[in-house]
Interface confidence: low
């Protein structure tokens, strides 16, 4: 959460001399209450915009717009405090509109905008517009708040932003997974055009449960340039456990721009249709085994094996 770096912060408009200032989110009117205070904003509109920074990066920004109520209290309106709170971190950023001239009624409703709060993909924010001065203790509130959820990097508009591209939003691996004979899965995906390694994370589950019954990790070394954009095919051997039939395949890239934090892509294979009278599972055969510390399974022979090749 930050302000867009290089834009001149402007809030003046015809009939109003105004300046934008950084704010500590604690306006002086909290400490020194005034008798006469303005009413709250009438409407707050928030939408997502994309702006370029001074060095050409594209970042998502919140476009905040609000209007004033058409009552006499605008005579006491000295400005506004805009506050953006990132809900998962409690981080808050504020700016203050300081009116350098008195507001007067004119032929259309006063409207204000601000588009300089840089936000993160897939985060929720609470945006508050507080008219200044703030009310006396127990006075009528003169602010309005709205929550806004910034879309994730799958969203078309977000895909081209720098934070999304840096985390791998342009890469579409187009994963396909097919079940082979002899307890094997064939995973195929498109390599990106960077010499970097990938990991395939296989997690298997019983039909209707969310506790894993098998986990396996397979490493794919960095492709050579002539293999960029080619399909990589990997055959994973599953554990022979009846009922351990729903498989989630997750591919984690390690691109230079995002290292361990790149966007992961996944695909799921559902269990085959259950027959009317399911084959009984012997009660001594566990669906899954307890993990031993941080290692994989105790019995090495029980681990999955795999091999892969890049397909041209």
């Amino acid at each position: 959460l930050r302000l867009l770096d290089h834009r001149a912060l402007v809030c003046s408009q015809p009939g109003l001399n105004c300046t934008v200032k950084n704010s500590t989110c604690l306006d002086d009117s909290w400490i020194h209450p005034r008798n006469l205070t303005p009413s709250s904003p009438k409407n707050i509109y928030i939408n997502l915009s994309v702006s370029s920074t001074q060095h050409g990066e594209l970042v998502p920004v919140l476009h905040v717009e609000w209007t004033l109520q058409t009552d006499a209290s605008i005579l006491y309106l000295e400005g506004a405090e805009l506050s953006v709170l990132q809900l998962n971190t409690n981080e808050r950023l504020c700016v203050r509109f300081e009116f350098l001239s008195k507001l007067r009624h004119h032929h259309r409703r006063w409207r204000f905008t601000f588009s300089h709060f840089v936000v993160d993909p897939d985060q929720e924010y609470e945006v508050t517009v507080h008219h200044l001065p703030k009310p006396i203790p127990d006075g009528d509130p003169n602010h309005q708040s709205k929550n806004f959820l910034v879309p994730d990097c799958e969203h078309a508009r977000m895909k081209v932003t720098t934070p999304c591209m840096s985390s791998g939003s342009l890469w579409d691996p187009n994963i396909t997974v097919e079940t082979l004979e002899a307890h094997q899965l064939r995973v195929s995906f498109t390599l990106w055009n960077e010499s970097t390694h990938y990991q395939i994370l296989l997690t298997s589950f019983p039909h209707m449960e969310n506790h894993s019954c098998f986990e396996h990790m397979h490493h794919i070394p960095a492709p050579r340039p002539e293999e960029f954009h080619q399909r990589s095919n990997v055959t994973l051997t599953l554990r022979n456990l009846k009922g351990c039939c729903r498989h989630q395949v997750q591919i984690q890239p390690f691109f230079s721009s995002c290292l361990n934090d790149c966007l992961r892509h996944s695909a799921t294979v559902s269990c085959p249709e259950m027959p009317d009278t399911p084959e009984p599972i012997p009660d001594y055969m566990p669906l899954w085994e307890p993990r031993s510390g941080s290692s994989d399974y105790k019995d090495d022979d029980d681990k999955g094996s795999s091999h892969h090749h890049h397909h041209h």
């Epitope: 720098t162 960077e194 230079s256």
Partner: antibody, heavy 126, light 113 residues
Framework: QVQLVQSGAEVKKPGASVKVSCKAS????????MHWVRQAPGQGLEWMGW????????DLAQRFQGRVTMTRDTSISTAYMELSRLRSDDTAVYYC???????????????????WGRGTLVTVSS | DIVMTQSPDSLAVSLGERATINCKTS????????????LAWYQQKPGQPLNLLIY???TRESGVPDRFSGSGSGTDFTLTISSLQAEDVAVYYC?????????FGPGTKVDIK
């Protein structure tokens, strides 16, 4: 070889629309941003905006917002720029230009233009 | 928007002599944390595509003869042709790519004296 080939000259009436095409060859079309720049007769160069061929995302100069649409067809490595509600002062040569390399995920947003089309003359006259 | 100005509007130089073109930006195009100036120079010959000569204010594009050089920082930049050749007759433009909208200088026409 690496080149951008643009469509031929157009004569349009005021109020009409024009769609200029730019076919890329010799490089990976989706790895570079495509920009459009115009030059009115005897005037300088004016940047109109860019399009990201992989996603179709665009960023337009403010004065063209609402009148310019940038699209692409990745199957034929072609970018398009459509300008609507034409006025006589839209008479200009319209260039496509490549800029902003995106071969890895740490994309370059450094938009100098290293490859240009020859330009398409659009004349707006009643 | 960043406003670009160029001087002179045109110049005529004898073959083999030095030609110097100046470009001024209305605000600095130096991005200090990268220590790079976001400025490029282009050549435009009649009926031909524009040609990138210099980027980052001083980096020569591959294939561009070494008689072309760029210098300057912040708001003041120069393109120098150390020994003018007949094929250098053209209009030369500077461009900032520091912030959108990207803007170009009005151009400088170079002729043979």
């Amino acid at each position: 070889q690496v080149q951008l080939v643009q469509s031929g000259a157009e004569v349009k009436k005021p109020g009409a629309s024009v769609k200029v095409s730019c076919k890329a060859s010799g490089y990976s079309f989706t790895d570079y941003y495509m920009h459009w720049v115009r030059q009115a007769p005897g005037q300088g160069l004016e940047w109109m905006g860019w399009m990201h061929p992989n996603s179709g995302g665009t960023d337009l100069a403010q004065r063209f917002q609402g009148r310019v649409t940038m699209t692409r067809d990745t199957s034929i490595s072609t970018a398009y720029m459509e300008l609507s509600r034409l006025r006589s002062d839209d008479t200009a040569v319209y260039y496509c230009a490549r800029g902003g390399y995106c071969s890895t995920l740490s994309c370059s947003f450094y938009w100098y233009f290293d490859l240009w089309g020859r330009g398409t003359l659009v004349t707006v006259s009643s | 928007d960043i406003v670009m100005t160029q001087s002179p509007d045109s110049l005529a130089v004898s073959l083999g002599e030095r030609a110097t073109i100046n470009c001024k930006t209305s605000q600095s195009v130096l991005y200090s944390s990268k220590n790079k100036n976001f400025l490029a120079w282009y050549q435009q010959k009649p009926g031909q595509p524009l040609n990138l000569l210099i980027y980052w204010a001083s980096t020569r594009e591959s294939g561009v003869p070494d008689r072309f050089s760029g210098s300057g920082s912040g708001t003041d930049f120069t393109l120098t042709i150390s020994s003018l050749q007949a094929e250098d007759v053209a209009v030369y433009y500077c461009q900032q790519y520091y912030s959108t909208p990207f803007t170009f200088g009005p151009g400088t026409k170079v002729d043979i004296k």
